[in-house]
């Protein structure tokens, strides 16, 4: 019966142990624990390799230790003279004495306690596919964000379902696309357009790379489209094998992507659109609308492109255009976004030269680089004048964005040599 | 420098001082020093200084020390077991690549290299400036920079001078078109310790500039005529060596 702790004493302890004794103790603690065995007393006849008398500690087929002689604790605050830690729940202790003892030896006193083992780190085989969590007496597996634990409680997959796409036009891609998609996952995407719109899916052959079918032609990883009672697919392989335009004849489409444990590829990317409250044409300075129409209606999408030298700053990254949608409330989406002058930022420093601070760093501003005269001159021409261009770079008419190079002037002494008359 | 005058480093801002062996060199850009092969053949990690007229220890401490990264000796320079017995100074030219770029200013700036056109072919009588801290009439080594102006002379003038302390037969000394002979006027000449310094000639296409027409190489006898490495013959090798051993910052 496993126990959490116990005591092991040599025969007759604390009196002298008898000659010609062989005694063994089988220690067992509950599953999921290791054993900490420690000796608080050790007084056994000393011999080379403990050949005469000894206490042996055995774990499975491995001898963890063989003790004899006298030991005393190195730590004044601890009675422990020798200790063993094993990550298994069984241990055998064997005490042997030979036919004679030259002196009176009192043997040993030992204690064992069950200790937690770390199944996550103490063994070669990692039990979990992703994250392993140790607890006293066992362990459990867990998953990174967006993954979930399968029924085997060891492997994780991605819970990539639940996305509902209601926009009139959009793009859907497998998780991580174009990086390999996750293993062991089922991803379900739903497109739900208002009634009166048919979902049309367009795929490019090169935007599809899914683990190929087995020899029987069954897809190991697959992409399936389900529109009402009609199914398109399953599809798999390198290059999309189905029609590049799928007219679903439905406003609702379920996209199911199923992956197994092996052979992840880059996945897939598709575009979809829906085939037919007006929104007013707003005045957005420094931009053009595409397409230009006399009237815009619900679900119309325009691309607003900034004029050269202007940009829309979204999420701290400059873009030259953005999309706006005529919404059901008669207002345009992204109405807060505006085209503002490009900021080229602080000009770069150059070696052996300088640039004067410009009054402005916005589009059209001009800066001038100069070299540290008279010791350096501008080697690569261009005159040193740069303007803030529409792409956000400081640009020179000759060098483009390349910076001027200040190189040493050669062969000019600061003072001419004058021979002194003798 | 024999028969020369006191000079200021501002007259020769390209002048580089080598302390072992005691010699000279010429700064040709931020990363490169041109010198004579015989200066660096025995010490591939020379310590160099720029920007100081005086090479007194206390003054050198305040000047700019240059650290070499690599020494490139011309492949045509023959390395000898016993350099002291050398009679062949052909291809006496070397480049020293510096670890860090030199900051230019009034006391430190490079000398130009000769162009490849015939404008840079020297004629007898063309004047050049030499400078250095080598032997003078009075002492073995100068503490303050000396300089002299001397004319280019026909090579035979150098051949005619008897070698002062010959280490071999007079016929053994090699004279080649890679050498310039200069001097013979008022006893002005370069001497031991001036090696590697520039023989600076006014640029024919820009009178405000000087170029390194020669490098102090060897001579039969100080105070007569001296032989200088003809730098024009090595411009291709200099440019190729610098190009192949440059960093992105320089390109």
């Amino acid at each position: 019966e496993p126990t959490m702790y116990g005591e092991i004493l040599s025969p007759n302890y604390p009196q002298a142990y008898p000659s010609e004794v062989e005694k063994s103790w089988d220690i067992e603690v509950p599953e999921g624990y290791g054993i900490h065995l420690y000796f608080t007393h050790l007084d056994i006849e000393l011999s080379e390799n403990c050949a005469y008398d000894s206490v042996q500690i055995i774990s499975g087929d491995t001898e963890e230790g063989r003790l004899c002689g006298q030991r005393s604790s190195n730590n004044p605050h601890s009675p422990i003279v020798e200790e063993f830690q094993v990550p298994y729940n069984k241990l055998q202790v064997i005490f042997k004495s030979d036919f004679s003892n030259e002196e009176r030896f009192t043997g040993f006193a030992a204690y064992y306690v069950a200790t937690d083992i770390n199944e996550c780190t103490d063994f070669v085989d990692v039990p979990c596919s992703h994250f392993c969590n140790n607890f006293i007496g066992g362990y459990f597996c867990s998953c990174p964000p967006e993954y979930f634990l399968h029924d085997d409680m060891k492997n994780c997959g991605v819970n990539c379902s639940g996305d509902v796409f209601t926009a009139l036009i959009g793009e859907i891609a497998s998780p991580n696309y174009p990086k390999p998609y996750p293993e062991n996952s089922r991803c379900e995407y739903q497109i739900r357009l208002e009634k009166g719109f048919q979902v049309v899916v367009t795929l490019r052959r090169e935007d599809f790379d899914v683990e190929a079918a087995d020899s029987a032609g069954n897809c190991l990883d697959s992409l399936v489209f389900v529109a009402g009672d009609r199914q398109f697919g399953p599809y798999c392989g390198h290059g999309f094998p189905g029609p590049l335009n799928i007219e679903t004849k439905s406003n609702a489409l379920d996209i199911i992507f199923q992956t197994d444990l092996t052979g992840q590829k880059k996945g897939w990317k598709l575009r979809y659109h829906g085939d037919p409250m007006p929104c007013p044409k707003e005045d957005t300075p420094n931009s053009v609308w595409e397409p230009a129409k006399a009237k815009y209606v619900f679900r119309d999408v325009v691309q607003i492109t900034c004029l050269d030298g202007f940009e829309v700053v979204e999420g701290r990254v400059g873009a030259t255009s953005f999309y706006s949608t005529c919404q059901s409330n008669g207002k345009w989406s992204n109405s807060k976004l505006k085209c503002q002058p490009v900021d080229c930022g602080i000009p770069e420093s150059i070696e052996n030269g300088k640039v004067e601070d410009p009054e402005s760093t916005l589009f059209g501003s001009v800066i001038r680089y100069t070299c540290e005269e008279p010791y350096y001159y501008m080697e690569n021409g261009g005159g040193g004048e740069y303007h803030c261009a529409g792409n956000g770079s400081w640009v020179n008419e000759v060098l483009g964005p390349e910076l001027p190079k200040c190189v040493p002037v050669c062969g000019v002494p600061r003072e001419p040599f004058e021979e002194k008359q003798r | 420098i024999i028969g020369g005058s006191d000079a200021d480093i501002k007259n020769f801002p390209w002048q580089v001082f080598f302390d072992n062996p005691w010699a000279g060199g010429a700064l040709i850009n931020e990363y490169w020093v041109l010198t004579a092969a015989h200066v660096v053949e025995g010490n591939r990690e020379p310590t160099m200084y720029v920007g100081s007229t005086s090479v007194q220890t206390s003054r050198l401490a305040k000047s700019k020390m240059l650290t070499p990264e690599h020494v490139f000796i011309h492949p045509g320079w023959k390395l000898l077991e016993v350099p002291e017995g050398r009679t062949n100074f052909d291809n006496d030219i070397a480049l020293v690549r510096l670890k860090d770029p030199v900051k230019m200013g009034p006391t430190v700036s490079p000398i130009c290299l000769p162009g490849t056109s015939s404008d840079y072919n020297l004629m007898d009588g063309d004047l050049g400036l030499i400078s250095g801290w080598g032997r003078t009439e009075k002492r073995d080594r100068a503490v303050r920079l000396k300089a002299a102006r001397l004319p280019v002379a026909p090579l035979r003038k150098c051949k005619e001078v008897k070698v002062e302390k010959p280490t071999a037969d007079a016929e053994a000394y090699v004279f080649t078109p890679n050498m310039i002979c200069a001097g013979g006027e008022k006893g002005m000449d370069s001497c031991k310790g001036d090696s590697g310094g520039a023989f600076a000639v006014q640029d024919p296409n820009d009178k405000t500039k000087f170029y390194a027409a020669g490098l102090v190489s060897w001579g039969p006898q100080c105070g007569t005529y001296g032989l200088y490495t003809r730098v024009k013959n090595y411009v291709d090798w200099i440019m190729k060596t610098m190009q192949e051993n440059s960093t992105p910052r320089e390109d």
Epitope: I346, E348, S349, E351, K354, D357, E359 | R249
Partner: antibody
Framework: EVMLVESGGGLVKPGGSLRLSCAAS????????MSWVRQAPGKGLEWVAT????????YYLDSVKGRFTISRDNSKDTLYLQMNSLRAEDTALYYC???????????WGQGTLVTVSS | QIVLTQSPATLSLSPGERATLSCTAS???????LHWYQQKPGKAPKLWIY???NLASGVPSRFSGSGSGTDYTLTISSLQPEDFATYYC??????????FGQGTKLEIK
């Protein structure tokens, strides 16, 4: 030899102020844009602010905008960072750095420690 | 803002081995504005590689840098004991903030 030496760090209570200085030498200070970068104990580098060579243009990390001011005195070859309304999360080693080609930070000071704690 | 993600967070290798440190940007970065720094404990960072592939002064030739767009790499061909340190990638973009990666600690195995 290019040198940047920061000073002015210390222990300050939340809501307090500090002014950091960075003394530059060995280069023409007025030719270079400069930055402050900080590093919280045991953490990575975080850019704080940048100033142009002449001091007319400044950029800040959002979390310090309105509380910190970067400035420079080119006549004294010194860069400053005035830090007001300090918070515990501003605790870090603050470095000044010189900006070079591509806005790479080619020279850094040794750093000055700012500790914000009650 | 442009987020730089360095991988791995820690790299344990032995001297003589080849090390590859990766830096991935959330948006495309100009190769002229992507730099690497080396930092040792208790010391200030040092510019190590600038503009993707140019070694800073004094950096040994066993180091190299490459990349474009969103993916950049620092490679050490044969690790020397003095190379064990933390390496940060850094990008400049004209709109603040300027960002650093979280660092890769290169440690002796």
């Amino acid at each position: 030899e290019v040198m940047l030496v920061e000073s002015g760090g210390g222990l300050v209570k939340p809501g307090g102020s500090l002014r950091l200085s960075c003394a530059a030498s060995g280069f023409t200070f007025s030719n270079y844009a400069m930055s402050w970068v900080r590093q919280a104990p045991g953490k990575g580098l975080e850019w704080v602010a940048t100033i142009s060579s002449g001091g007319s243009h400044t950029y800040y990390l959002d979390s310090v905008k309105g509380r910190f001011t970067i400035s420079r005195d080119n006549s004294k070859d010194t860069l400053y960072l005035q830090m007001n309304s300090l918070r515990a999360e501003d605790t870090a080693l603050y470095y000044c750095a010189r900006l070079f080609t591509g806005h790479a930070m080619d020279y850094w000071g040794q750093g000055t420690l700012v500790t914000v704690s009650s | 803002q442009i987020v730089l993600t360095q991988s791995p967070a820690t790299l344990s290798l032995s001297p003589g081995e080849r090390a590859t440190l990766s830096c991935t940007a959330s948006s495309s970065v100009s190769s002229s504005y992507l730099h690497w720094y080396q930092q040792k404990p208790g010391k200030a960072p040092k510019l190590w590689i600038y503009s993707t592939s140019n070694l800073a002064s004094g950096v040994p030739s066993r180091f190299s840098g490459s990349g474009s767009g969103t993916d950049y790499t620092l490679t050490i061909s044969s690790l020397q004991p003095e190379d064990f340190a933390t390496y940060y990638c850094h990008q400049y973009y004209r709109l603040p903030p300027i960002t650093f990666g979280q660092g890769t600690k290169l440690e002796i195995k």
